[in-house]
Interface confidence: low
C-alpha cells in the first residue's frame, strides 16, 4: 500500500489584496478514510481555514468536489485577500477515529505573502555640481514592495557599477518593504552626456526591472581653459584679440576684457559652440586700437564660470613701431 | 523615565544555555528595536543582533547564528535572549539596548548580565 | 563586516585639553557613526550620533565631525570626569560594529 503524501507544491504563494489566492494541495492516497482541513500556522494556536464537514467559511472554496469518492486534490481558494491573509497555510489529513478524528499527516506548508510591486525607481544626485576626477553620491529610493527580497543594480551607461551600499528596510516582518541605495561615482571629463540608471529587480516584475535614472550634467562641472592670442592681421589701426574658453561645462559663463587693469564694456563678436561630448567652447573677440597705444598694452579676459572664482589669461600686446607708423594710412 | 533592566548574574555549566531577560520600561516597547551587545576583554563590544518586539522581525550577526536567540513578549514589556551550548568563549557582559527601528544608534543600555561559563 | 579601527587604544592628556579621537571604518559610511562612553565598571553611553548630533544632556564640549569613512570626537577643555573609554559604531549596515575603544586617562 502507498504512503499517504501531501502535496503542497508551492513554497511560496504572492497574492495581491482584493484578489484570488488558489492554494494547492494534493494526496497521493486515498487512505487512511478521513478528511483534509487546512490550517493557518502551527501548534496549539493555528487557526482553522477550511473544513468541509463543519463550519462557516464564505471566503474560500474549493477547486474540486470534494464529495466525489475517488477525490485526491484539496486546493482551496479564498477571495478578498487582506493584509491579515498572510502566513503559512497546511492542509492536514486526519484519520477517522472515536470520539473525534487524529492528525495524520501535514503538508509542507505554502507560505502566502502580499505580492506588491515596487515603485518606479527615483534616483538623486548630489546637491552641487563636483569637478572631474571626484567622486560623488547618488541615491535611489523605491518604495512599497512585498516580499523583501529585493535586487538593486547601478549601471553607468551600461557598464555596471560595484561601489555601492543598499538598505532594504524594515529589517523585520513589514507588510511593505523600502530599499535605499547609495552609489559612488568617480566622474570623468566627458560625462556631460553620461546617465547613471538604478535598476530594481523584483519577483512581482515578471522579469522586467524597473529603471531610474539620473543625469551626470546635473552633478559634473568641467572648468574652462583658456588662451589669449593676438592675430597677426590688423584691421586698419585696430589688432584683434582673441579668448578662447574651451572645455567647459554647464553653459553659465561671463566674460569679460580688461585693457591695462581697466575693464572694457566693449567686445566685438562672440561665439558659441557645443562639442561632441556636451561640453562648450566660447571665443571671443576683442579689437584694441593701436592709434596712438603706448608699447605696454596688457589685455586680460577674465572668465567667471558657473558662480565659480574668476580665472584669467593675460596678454602682453605687441604692437610694432612699423605697425604704428602706418596705422594712420590704413582705411578702418 | 527610559529604563532597561537587566536579569542578575549567571554562573553556568559548560554546554548548558541561559535565558537573560531586559525588562522595558517608560516607553513603548512595541515602537523600538531591543539589541543585544556582548562585551569581552578580547573582543570589545560586539552586536549580537536585534527585535523589534512589535513585528517580531529579527537581524543577527552571523557570528552568533545558532548561539543567540532572540524573542519578546510584549505582554511583559520583556525582551529575552537565550544563549546556547555555553562555552568558555561566551562568559561576557551582556548589555541589552534600545534604538529606533531603522538604522539608529542605541540610545538607551540596561546595566548588563555578567554570564560565566566555568565547570 | 564593516571594520571600525580606533588608532590609539589609549591616550593621556592634561586637564583643560582639547583631543581628538580617530576612528576609520573599512568602507564608506555615509555619516552613520555613533560614539559611546563607558566608565568603568558602567554601561557605554551615548554621546553623538549620525557623526555630529549631540544626544540629550551631553555637554558641548563634546564634539563630532567626519565623512566618508573618517571620523572624529573631540574633547574641548578635558575634564576629570571624561575619563574613560570611547568607542565609536558604524550603524549603516549590519553587522553593526564597533571599534576597539580608546581609554582616556588623565596625566
Known amino acids: 500500500e502507498e504512503e499517504l503524501q501531501m502535496i503542497q507544491p508551492e513554497k511560496l504563494l504572492l497574492v495581491t489584496v482584493g484578489k484570488t489566492a488558489t492554494l494547492h494541495c494534493t494526496v497521493t492516497s486515498l487512505l487512511p478514510v478521513g478528511p483534509v482541513l487546512w490550517f493557518r500556522g502551527v501548534g496549539p494556536g493555528r487557526e482553522l481555514i477550511y473544513n468541509q464537514k463543519e463550519g462557516h467559511f464564505p471566503r474560500v472554496t474549493t477547486v474540486s468536489d470534494l464529495t466525489k469518492r475517488n477525490n485526491m486534490d484539496f486546493s482551496i481558494r479564498i477571495s478578498s485577500i487582506t493584509p491579515a491573509d498572510v502566513g503559512t497555510y497546511y492542509c492536514v489529513k486526519f484519520r477517522k477515529g472515536s470520539p473525534e478524528n487524529v492528525e495524520f499527516k501535514s503538508g509542507p506548508g505554502t507560505e502566502m505573502a502580499l505580492g506588491a510591486k515596487p515603485s518606479a525607481p527615483v534616483v538623486l544626485g548630489p546637491a552641487a555640481r563636483t569637478t572631474p576626477e571626484h567622486t560623488v553620491s547618488f541615491t535611489c529610493e523605491s518604495h512599497g514592495f512585498s516580499p523583501r527580497d529585493i535586487t538593486l543594480k547601478w549601471f553607468k551607461n551600461g557598464n555596471e557599477l560595484s561601489d555601492f551600499q543598499t538598505n532594504v528596510d524594515p529589517t523585520g516582518q513589514s507588510v511593505a518593504y523600502s530599499i535605499r541605495s547609495t552609489a559612488r561615482v568617480v566622474l570623468d571629463p566627458w560625462d556631460v552626456r553620461s546617465q547613471v540608471i538604478c535598476e530594481v529587480a523584483h519577483v512581482t516584475l515578471q522579469g522586467d526591472p524597473l529603471r531610474g535614472t539620473a543625469n551626470l550634467s546635473e552633478a559634473i562641472r568641467v572648468p574652462p581653459t583658456l588662451e589669449v592670442t593676438q592675430q597677426p592681421m590688423r584691421v586698419g589701426n585696430q589688432v584683434n584679440v582673441t579668448c578662447q574658453v574651451r572645455k567647459f561645462y554647464p553653459q553659465s559663463l561671463q566674460l569679460t576684457w580688461s585693457e591695462n587693469g581697466n575693464v572694457c564694456q566693449r567686445e566685438t563678436a562672440s561665439t558659441l559652440t557645443e562639442n561632441k561630448d556636451g561640453t562648450y567652447n566660447w571665443t571671443s573677440w576683442f579689437l584694441v586700437n593701436i592709434s596712438d597705444q603706448r608699447d605696454d598694452v596688457v589685455l586680460t579676459c577674465q572668465v567667471k564660470h558657473d558662480g565659480q572664482l574668476a580665472v584669467s589669461k593675460r596678454l602682453a600686446l605687441e604692437v610694432t613701431v612699423h605697425q604704428k607708423d602706418q596705422s594712420s594710412d590704413a582705411t578702418p | 523615565e527610559v529604563q532597561l533592566q537587566e536579569s542578575g548574574a549567571e554562573l553556568v555549566r559548560p554546554g548548558a544555555s541561559v535565558k537573560l531577560s531586559c525588562k522595558a520600561l517608560?516607553?513603548?516597547?512595541?515602537?523600538?528595536?531591543i539589541h543585544w551587545v556582548k562585551e569581552t576583554p578580547v573582543y570589545g563590544l560586539e552586536w549580537i543582533g536585534d527585535?523589534?518586539?512589535?513585528?517580531?522581525?529579527?537581524a543577527n550577526n552571523q557570528k552568533f547564528k545558532g548561539k543567540a536567540t532572540l524573542t519578546a513578549d510584549k505582554s511583559s514589556n520583556t525582551a529575552y535572549m537565550e544563549l546556547s551550548s555555553l562555552t568558555s568563549e561566551d562568559s561576557a557582559v551582556y548589555y541589552c539596548?534600545?534604538?529606533?527601528?531603522?538604522?539608529?544608534?542605541?540610545?538607551?543600555w540596561g546595566q548588563g548580565t555578567s554570564v560565566t561559563v566555568s565547570s | 563586516d564593516i571594520q571600525m579601527t580606533q588608532s590609539s587604544s589609549s591616550f593621556s592628556g592634561s586637564l583643560g585639553d582639547r583631543l581628538t579621537i580617530n576612528c576609520k571604518a573599512s568602507e564608506d559610511i555615509y555619516d552613520r557613526v555613533a560614539w559611546y562612553q563607558q566608565k568603568p565598571g558602567n554601561a557605554p553611553r551615548l554621546l553623538i550620533s549620525g557623526t555630529a548630533s549631540l544626544e540629550t544632556g551631553v555637554l558641548s564640549r563634546f564634539s563630532g565631525s567626519g565623512s566618508g569613512k573618517d571620523y572624529t570626537l573631540s574633547i574641548n577643555g578635558l575634564q576629570a570626569e571624561d575619563v574613560a573609554t570611547y568607542y565609536c559604531q558604524q550603524y549603516w549596515t549590519t553587522p553593526w560594529t564597533f571599534g576597539g575603544g580608546t581609554k582616556l586617562e588623565i596625566k
Open positions: 539596548t534600545r534604538a529606533v527601528s531603522g538604522y539608529y544608534a542605541m540610545d538607551y
Open positions: 517608560g516607553y513603548t516597547f512595541t515602537d523600538y528595536e
Open positions: 527585535i523589534h518586539p512589535g513585528s517580531g522581525g529579527t
